[in-house]
């Protein structure tokens, strides 16, 4: 049938965390910082006054198919997308007196995956090819985690999957799915 030439247009079996979009405004926690808090001045110890758990680290369900080349999972998988603000944004007055939000330069708390779960999926392929079994690693819970600049990148990139890794004796497939395409796909989850 000539399907070897199929463009690898698949949803990444697990997308990079950095490819998740910011949630739309209506999904943000309704709890907003009081603009008059601390008289408009930043607190001396921004993370001492409020427990980090008070800030919004949302777990949003996202349903998608696992695809690999021309093959698609028989059923979609549902995983969590971690979203939201961890830790207070600080308020500084600008030159003309209106408030301005900015992120603290101290410890960086991020809403990121906390636990993962493995799920076996069956990939159905064209041309009468036998179904393929794949194990995917899906986000099971989210948490506000304190990240230092030192381990920032390694934490955020900890998002691999057995299915995404090339198997022995097989050439790895090119990752044709762009971050932009993944973002569009994820935006529909909300």
């Amino acid at each position: 049938q000539g399907w070897q030439a199929f463009k690898n247009d698949a949803t990444e079996i697990i997308p990079e965390l950095g490819e998740y979009p910011e949630p739309p405004p209506e999904l943000e926690n309704n709890k907003t910082m009081n603009r008059a808090e601390n008289g408009g001045r930043p607190p001396h110890h921004p993370f001492e006054t409020k427990d980090v758990s008070e800030y919004s680290c949302r777990e949003l369900h996202f349903t998608r198919y696992v695809t690999d080349g021309p093959c698609r999972s028989a059923k979609p998988v549902t995983e969590l997308v971690c979203s939201g603000q961890c830790g207070p944004a600080r308020l500084l007055p600008n030159a003309i007196g209106r408030g301005k939000w900015w992120r603290p330069s101290g410890p960086d708390f991020r809403c990121i995956p906390d636990r993962y779960r493995a799920q076996r999926v069956q990939l159905l392929c064209p041309g009468g090819e036998a179904p393929r079994a794949r194990k995917v690693r899906l986000v099971a819970s989210c948490k506000c985690k304190r990240l230092t600049r030192f381990h920032n990148q390694s934490e955020l990139k900890d998002f691999g999957t057995e299915a995404a890794r090339p198997q022995k004796g097989r050439k790895p497939r090119p990752r044709a799915r762009s971050a932009k395409a993944n973002q569009a796909e994820l935006e529909n989850a909300y």
């Epitope: 199929f6 695809t67 021309p70 093959c71 698609r72 059923k75 549902t78 796909e185 529909n188």
Partner: antibody, heavy 119, light 110 residues
Framework: CQSVEESGGRLVTPGTPLTLTCTVS????????MYWVRQAPGKGLEYIGF?????AVSYATWAKGRFTISRTSTTVDLKITSPTTEDTATYFC???????????????WGPGTLVTVSS | AYDMTQTPASVEVAVGGTVTIKCQAS??????LAWYQQKPGQPPKLLIY???TLASGVSSRFKGSGYGTQFTLTISGVECADAATYYC????????????FGGGTEVVVK
């Protein structure tokens, strides 16, 4: 005999929420994905969304926020949150052809239920 | 994303003739395509799934083919009962989708 049937369609005024119900017989809902599709008078088929489980629900981009799909052990509901005149259509409920595979042909379909939104 | 375009919008065919309906996907959908027949006042009826597999109880006069972005439904030995509107439906992706169905093709039998 496996069948699905929609109910709840009626004349409503704009902004009045309306819930349509799809009742199934001859098969277990837990084994299948269920879909909602609508068809405005004289127009084509328009996909609204589907439900696989309580957490696995997906909507067409235009339907997000306008519709809510939920299910019980024997029924699938479609809530039109704030109907407008553009939501006037026949609403169909359909099941996956094969319980093991979603979005792989819908069969059976219900006969449809007509929703008219008018002031 | 994954928009489905059907051509022609309407076609006339004589009894006994052959009619071909095309469906084009804006992005490759492998073989995840179904075809439906709908008559006025009735729900759609599944004809073909996975691009070329005939649904249960459907006449072998209906034939589906295609892969990737280009698909075809061919009806041979057309009968009066084939007068209907035909729709294609993609089954590859559920995210960022406006509609999984094509716009429909009306088949008029003379």
């Amino acid at each position: 005999c496996q069948s699905v049937e929609e109910s709840g369609g009626r004349l409503v005024t704009p902004g009045t929420p309306l819930t349509l119900t799809c009742t199934v017989s001859g098969f277990s809902l837990s084994s299948y994905s269920m879909y909602w599709v609508r068809q405005a008078p004289g127009k084509g088929l328009e996909y609204i969304g589907f439900i696989l489980s309580a957490t696995a629900v997906s909507y067409a981009t235009w339907a997000k926020g306008r519709f809510t799909i939920s299910r019980t052990s024997t029924t699938v509901d479609l809530k039109i949150t704030s109907p407008t005149t553009e939501d006037t259509a026949t609403y169909f409920c359909a099941r996956d052809r094969d319980g093991g595979t979603t979005l792989d042909g819908f069969d059976p379909w219900g006969p449809g239920t007509l929703v008219t939104v008018s002031s | 994303a994954y928009d489905m375009t059907q051509t022609p919008a309407s076609v006339e065919v004589a009894v006994g003739g052959t009619v071909t309906i095309k469906c084009q996907a804006s992005e490759s959908i492998s073989t995840w395509l179904a075809w439906y027949q709908q008559k006025p006042g009735q729900p759609p009826k599944l004809l073909i799934y996975r691009a070329s597999t005939l649904a249960s109880g459907v006449s072998s006069r209906f034939k589906g083919s295609g892969y990737g972005t280009q698909f075809t439904l061919t009806i041979s030995g057309v009968e009066c009962a084939d007068a209907a509107t035909y729709y294609c439906q993609q089954g590859w992706n559920i995210n960022n989708i406006d509609n999984i169905f094509g716009g429909g093709t009306e088949v008029v039998v003379k």
